[in-house]
């Protein structure tokens, strides 16, 4: 396979990565598509040009119980609750009870390495796409989509509106994160197009919740994830020697 070739022996520099990707491009094109059925790597959806892999959580170890309160200080003013003179009944009746009766199907136990949204094998046409959250509501949110407490310096990354709070990065991410970041940079340069993966959180544990956090490729791509995966494995193997 091309990753064994000389161009892919040293993936520590960007130029080498580019060479490796160029060398592997024919192999990648010849691969079986990740989403079979429509002749290329795109899922069968209403919008085949968009490849979304929402909420990849490389870093989630087991299931967290995030029942911490998000309450702000007690002295904060209230904007959303209008004052009422008395406590009379509401003019309109409340909602009628639903007869959904749906019982939840809890996930089976804890997994040591929780990757339930890393959907290599998800059926054709399925992709996770949460609705974006705009906490500031009617204010212009292009610069500040989330509370400051959640913001982290995103070096080399664009904070897309609607994307969410980012917890502090783990110190242990280290070399693997560097490699992965280089691969992503290489992928973007290769295509010279908007390959946006700015909230693809490789190494940091979630704070309370990741919002948005999906990646999209606006142009049809060869399945570079396969290359990334193999390159990462290869790199890890080399380090182990």
């Amino acid at each position: 396979w091309c990753l064994e070739s000389s161009q892919c022996q040293d993936l520590t520099t960007e130029s080498n990565l580019l060479e490796c990707i160029r060398a592997c491009k024919p192999d990648l094109s010849a691969e079986t598509p990740m989403f079979p059925g429509n002749g290329d790597e795109q899922p069968l959806t209403e919008n085949p040009r968009k490849y979304v892999m929402g909420h990849f959580r490389w870093d989630r170890f087991g299931r967290r119980n995030s029942s911490s309160s998000g309450s702000s200080g007690a002295g904060q003013k209230r904007e959303d609750v209008s004052a009422g003179e008395d406590c009379g009944p509401l003019p309109e009746g409340g909602p009628e009870p639903r007869s959904d009766g749906a019982k939840p199907g809890p996930r089976e136990g804890k997994r040591s390495y929780s990757m339930e949204h890393f959907r290599w094998g998800k059926p054709v046409g399925k992709k996770r796409r949460p609705v974006k959250v705009y906490p500031n509501g009617a204010e212009d949110e292009s610069a500040e989509a989330f509370p400051l407490e959640f913001k982290r310096e995103l070096t080399g990354q664009r904070l897309r509106e609607g994307d969410g709070p980012d917890g502090p990065a783990d110190d242990g991410a280290g070399a693997q994160a560097d490699l992965e970041h280089s691969l992503l940079v290489a992928a973007e340069k290769k295509d010279e197009g908007p390959y946006r993966m700015e909230h693809f959180r490789w190494g940091s544990p979630p704070k309370d919740k990741r919002y948005g956090g999906f990646m999209t490729s606006e142009k049809s791509q060869t399945p570079l994830v396969t290359l990334f995966k193999n390159a990462i494995i290869k790199n890890a193997y080399k380090k182990g020697e």
């Epitope: 919008n47 979304v52 609705v131 959250v133 906490p135 609607g162």
Partner: antibody, heavy 114, light 110 residues
Framework: QQQLEESGGGLVKPGGTLTLTCKGS?????????MCWVRQAPGKGLEWIGC???????TYYPTWAKGRFTISKPSSTTVDLKMTSLTAADTATYFC???????WGQGTLVTVSS | DIVMTQTPASVSEPVGGTVTIKCQAS??????LAWYQQKPGQPPKLLIY???TLKSGVSSRFRGSGSGTEYTLTISDLECADAATYYC????????????FGGGTEVVVK
């Protein structure tokens, strides 16, 4: 200050077609937002109809709405909801909203009756 | 599709009291949950997102908690102005029927 306003509601006969418009002020749909439609039948709860990603034009609907409801972005300041084959069950106040936020229009009432 | 079951349908508490509203998802929605307050003749207003994050400007008397499939909105030190209908909404996945509202809870303040 961003604002949304729905229009196009009114009385329509069963089987008819109606297009509602959500007009934004202080907000440009040429930017990327999730703009959604939600409805509420009189005295009932809220029901999600679908959303459009105004940047890409991608649309998303629940199974029940697919085929009969179509969300589009005809201009940089408006998002439309086209409803076909209307029945009495579609009688509701229709809201447009910016994703998950407090930015909602006041709603427009659609009454389907013969 | 994800079904949100909200309980109770209606609750009545005196001023100063506490109300607890529960929302159960038919599958794990990973805290992609919002709580809204709606008063008659008005559109809903966002109170909480991410299951527990309070929207700026909303009183800290509103508290959201939960994870997985079970979520709770707690309103403490009830005021008359809290009389409204409250809805939970999951925004987990627009692409796979993963956005829906709970049936709503009418809160009456005595």
């Amino acid at each position: 200050q961003q604002q949304l306003e729905e229009s196009g509601g009114g009385l329509v006969k069963p089987g008819g077609t109606l297009t509602l418009t959500c007009k934004g002020s202080g907000i440009a749909f040429s930017d990327t937002y999730d703009m959604c439609w939600v409805r509420q039948a009189p005295g009932k709860g809220l029901e999600w109809i679908g959303c459009i990603d105004t940047g890409s034009g991608d649309t998303y609907y629940p199974t029940w709405a697919k085929g009969r409801f179509t969300i589009s972005k005809p201009s940089s300041t408006t998002v439309d909801l086209k409803m076909t084959s209307l029945t009495a069950a579609d009688t509701a106040t229709y809201f447009c909203a910016k994703g998950v936020s407090s930015l909602w229009g006041q709603g427009t009432l659609v009454t389907v009756s013969s | 599709d994800i079904v949100m079951t909200q309980t109770p349908a209606s609750v009545s508490e005196p001023v100063g009291g506490t109300v607890t509203i529960k929302c159960q998802a038919s599958e794990d929605i990973e805290s992609d949950l919002a709580w809204y307050q709606q008063k008659p003749g008005q559109p809903p207003k966002l109170l909480i997102y991410g299951a527990s994050t309070l929207k700026s400007g909303v009183s800290s008397r509103f508290r959201g908690s939960g994870s997985g499939t079970e979520y709770t909105l707690t309103i403490s030190d009830l005021e008359c102005a809290d009389a409204a209908t409250y809805y939970c909404q999951t925004y987990y996945d627009m692409a796979d029927d993963g956005c829906s509202f709970g049936g709503g809870t009418e809160v009456v303040v005595k």
